[in-house]
Interface confidence: medium
């Protein structure tokens, strides 16, 4: 059937697009081009007579038009009117007519954004902050960026007015991030440099550490108060409602029971004018107080540190219990208890070792919890993953990469293109990419944390043409009805369809053939020694095709029930016994005889000279094929008469 | 000035054979498709053969089809129609014709004043 | 094959009328009809092709349009040469013709 494709689907403006035409028919009279969905003359653009070679512009022929021996017609310096409709029609030889329609759609290439602000220091849950992404741009998409992630889905976050303008309602500290936004139509996509929106909050409710509210006599008593804040909060103490002193820090030595009492922290901002406090009650005791968790390493990392975990306080002829996520420990290698059970330890930690944790102190009455705790394992960075997949892309489109690798904290990323740093971000975007971005594109991930990093490296190629496939296979000796083999053609690509050939031709239909992956892998279930063939994979584009070598599946199979030949089983005596044993296998198997049960030789043919009734008897031949592990045997029973004495019997061999 | 020249109709028995031939000049004729369109007495026109230029392609009506032949020489500038096999039904009055070179869709531009056939016993 | 209805088969009409002829296709022939106009005794005269396309030398109260399986030909003022026999003629496969529309003086 008659189709026009056109290249690009959606063009530049003063870029050129080719209307391609596929299925052109053989023996024709001429065509002609029309703008719109129908012929029209009043509408035509160019028109071609074969014959005369002849090509007569149209009413609607703008001098920026081409027309090829094929019908293809290429429009150059586009401008915005020649978005729409183009019909060829195509009149054949004997005058039967043909017609097809195409389109494309034309777009500006657009300039950086850049972002404005209604506020730049909002109050958090009083001010509404409206970002708007400039300039503004006629069929143009705008997506915003928080930290280079997409938008996360709130109700305090409003896209107005085409999705240019973002809207944060009741901003929180949490909105504090890098916003960028991001203009794209078909033909390109420009991002605007980073906005940081600087949240004022503040003071929350002071948190005074440590929790610990039960002391004993004797003890030093050193509070420290902290409330987020932003700017920072200023500091006030209070015992009992008087004041102490304006510092963030509390600090009572050798306490007695008549340092009980309220503690109150007063935390201040000056640029929000709100003031919070919180108040903590201590109990100075001379008995033990509520128990709570110590650690050795706050910030383990997995595999490589081990950390102790230690139930405070400690006191005497006391029994210590330990939970792990509110279950009782479990039994593990990786878990020590210290003789007294006050410590435990979990050595070289993994990320599943969060906790929470929590200790406890048992008395004659009853057992006293500490608080949890979790533990920030620190780990990573995997092995980063990119995707896509693709490896292969044709010139003109764009390189959108992203990486990910698991990492605690989150791994900061680097991309290297042919071992040149490129940016420092988690995704790369490289727009209308050509050939020369050909190459070696590796991301890093590095965890700052942990120091250690990691890499993946990914070859892209880009090429118009296509290249070479090549087969790769999961298992290259598969056992007869046993074993799958799965073919992939390499390299994945792009808009590309995967075609295969079995010994040069199409698929057969198969219950045991099955194609997944996009067609890219081709799957035999249960195979059999007849797949034993030449597998070829193909990809092709709209620009190219090519084939790759054949692959030759090596199927091992049997050993088959063997055949003895001849087939006679009566001889006469004095004559010669030639018995050859053959079974279908691959590899070929190794054979061997027995005679009476008796084993003979390990050779494929058994030969007795002038034989005797005394070689009377059963002849077994058993073959063996190691690579299938399988054996068979078949048994003959051979009969020798005295000379003379019974007639049609075998003179031998 | 485009002119077409029918001529070799007349009258014929049923089973009969006649050829119409049609004198072109005025335009380039090696190049253009032509066409033969009939029309018996007292009713509508019905298109019947065209040829391509090199006589490479015909095209025929299923009323016509194994009877008739449609041919051209380019150098006597000369369309002509084979009738074999003639019947009652095909008596008409018939016109060469011929399609234009910008022909989108086909048409036909100029027409012959046309010879009458009539097959009668 | 596709079969060609023009209606209506006669017409009487005055000079200075707006006339028109209809002619419906069997199927979808895109914009592939062409009319023509033939008085007694003489051979036809292309009028209009592609549906909507103005012969060279045709005069402009001549006009067509349609697409697909409805076509119209209109005379947007007859002039005493207008009155003829008019066919409609599509150029599919094969290329028949209507059955024709008398135009008559009233």
């Known amino acids: 059937k008659l189709t026009i494709e056109s290249t690009p689907f959606n063009v530049a403006e003063g870029k050129e697009v080719l209307l391609l035409v596929h299925n052109l028919p053989q023996h024709l009279f001429g065509y002609s081009w029309y703008k719109g969905e129908r012929v029209d003359g009043n509408r035509q653009i160019i028109g071609y007579v074969i014959g005369t070679q002849q090509a007569t512009p149209g009413p609607a022929y703008s001098g920026r038009e081409i027309i090829y021996p094929n019908a293809s017609l290429l429009i150059q310096n586009i401008i915005q009117n020649d978005t729409g409709f183009y019909t060829l029609h195509v009149i054949k030889s004997d005058l039967v007519n043909e017609e097809a329609t195409g389109q494309f759609r034309v777009y500006p290439e657009l300039p950086k954004p850049s972002i404005s602000s209604n506020n730049s220091k909002p109050v958090e849950d009083k001010d509404a902050v409206a970002f708007t992404c400039e300039p503004e741009t006629q069929d143009a998409t705008y997506l915003w960026w928080v930290n280079n992630q997409s938008l996360p889905v709130s109700p305090r976050l409003q896209l107005s007015n085409g999705n240019r303008t973002l809207t944060l309602f009741n901003v929180t500290r949490n909105d504090t991030a890098s916003y960028k936004c991001e203009t794209q139509n078909p033909v390109s996509a420009r991002r605007s440099d980073s906005v940081i929106l600087n949240v004022l909050y503040g003071p929350d409710a002071p948190t005074i550490s440590p929790l610990n509210t039960s002391y004993r006599s004797g003890e030093n008593l050193n509070l420290s108060c902290h409330a987020a804040s932003n700017p920072p909060a200023q500091y006030s103490w209070f015992v009992n409602g008087t004041f102490q002193q304006s510092t963030q820090e509390l600090f009572i030595p050798n306490i007695t029971v008549n340092n009980s009492g309220s503690y109150t922290c007063q935390a201040h901002n000056s640029d929000t004018g709100l003031n919070r406090t919180t108040v903590t009650t201590i109990t100075v005791y001379a008995e033990p107080p509520k128990p709570f968790i110590t650690s050795n390493n706050s910030n383990p990392v997995e595999d490589e540190d081990a950390v102790a975990l230690t139930c405070e306080p400690e006191i005497q002829n006391t029994t210590y219990l330990w939970w792990v996520n509110n279950q009782s420990l479990p039994v593990s290698p990786r878990l020590q208890l210290s003789n007294d059970n006050r410590t435990l330890t979990l050595l070289s930690v993994t990320r599943n070792d969060v906790g929470p944790y929590e200790c406890g102190i048992q008395n004659e009455l009853s057992v006293d919890h500490s608080d949890p705790v979790i533990l920030n394992v620190l780990y990573g960075p995997d092995d980063p993953t990119i995707s896509p997949s693709y490896t292969y892309y044709r010139p003109g489109v764009n390189l959108s990469l992203s990486c990910h690798a698991a990492s605690n904290p989150p791994a900061q990323y680097s991309w290297l293109i042919d071992g040149n740093i490129q940016q420092h971000t988690q995704e790369l975007f490289i727009s209308n990419i050509t050939e020369k971005n050909s190459g070696l594109y590796t991301c890093q991930a590095n965890n700052s944390a942990s120091g250690h990093s990691r890499t993946t490296v990914k070859t892209i190629t880009v090429s118009a043409e296509l290249p070479k496939p090549s087969i790769s296979s999961n298992n290259s000796k598969p056992v007869e009805d046993k074993d799958a083999v799965a073919f992939t053609c390499e390299p994945e690509a792009q808009n590309t369809t995967y075609l295969w050939w079995v010994n040069g031709q199409s698929l057969p239909v198969s219950p045991r053939l099955q194609l997944s992956n996009g067609n890219r892998t081709l799957t035999l279930f249960n195979v059999t020694r007849n797949d034993a063939r030449a597998y070829v994979c193909g990809i092709q584009n709209s620009v190219s095709a090519n084939r790759s070598d054949p692959v030759t599946l090596d199927v091992l199979y049997g050993p088959d029930t063997p055949i003895i030949s001849p087939p006679d089983s009566s001889y006469l005596s004095g004559a010669n016994l030639n018995l050859s044993c053959h079974s279908a296998s691959n590899p070929s198997p190794q054979y061997s005889w027995r005679i009476n049960g008796i084993p003979q030789q390990h050779t494929q043919v058994l030969f007795i000279a002038k034989i005797t009734p005394n070689n009377n008897g059963t002849y077994a031949c058993f073959v063996s094929n190691l690579a299938t592990g399988r054996n068979n045997s078949i048994v003959k029973s051979i009969t020798v008469s005295a000379s003379g004495t019974s007639p049609g019997l075998s003179a031998g061999a | 000035e485009v002119q077409l020249l029918e001529s070799g109709g007349g009258l014929v028995q049923p089973g009969g054979s006649l050829r119409l031939s049609c004198a072109a000049s005025?335009?380039?004729?090696?190049?253009?498709?032509m066409g033969w369109v009939r029309q018996a007495p007292g009713k509508g026109l019905e298109w019947v053969s065209s040829i391509g230029s090199g006589s490479y392609s015909t095209s025929y009506a299923d009323s016509v089809k194994g009877r008739f032949t449609i041919s051209r020489d380019n150098s006597k500038n000369t369309l002509y129609l084979q009738m074999n096999s003639l019947r009652a039904e095909d008596t008409a009055v018939y016109y060469c014709?011929?399609?234009?070179?910008?022909?989108?869709?086909?048409?036909?531009?100029?027409w012959g004043q046309g010879t009458l056939v009539t097959v009668s016993s | 094959d596709i079969q060609m209805t023009q209606s209506p088969s006669s017409l009487s009409a005055s000079v200075g009328d707006r006339v028109t002829i209809t002619c419906r296709a069997s199927?979808?022939?895109?914009?592939?009809l062409n009319w023509y106009q033939q008085k007694p005794g003489k051979a036809p005269k292309l009028l209009i092709y592609a549906a909507s396309s103005l012969q060279s030398g045709v005069p402009s109260r001549f006009s067509g349009s349609g697409s697909g399986t409805d076509f119209t030909l209109t005379i947007s003022s007859l002039q005493p040469e207008d009155f003829a026999t008019y066919y409609c003629q599509q150029a599919g496969n094969p290329h028949t013709f209507g059955q024709g529309t008398k135009l008559e003086i009233k």
């Open positions: 014709a011929r399609y234009p070179s910008v022909l989108f869709p086909p048409h036909l531009d100029y």
């Open positions: 005025g335009f380039t004729f090696s190049s253009s498709y």
């Open positions: 199927q979808s022939i895109s914009s592939y």
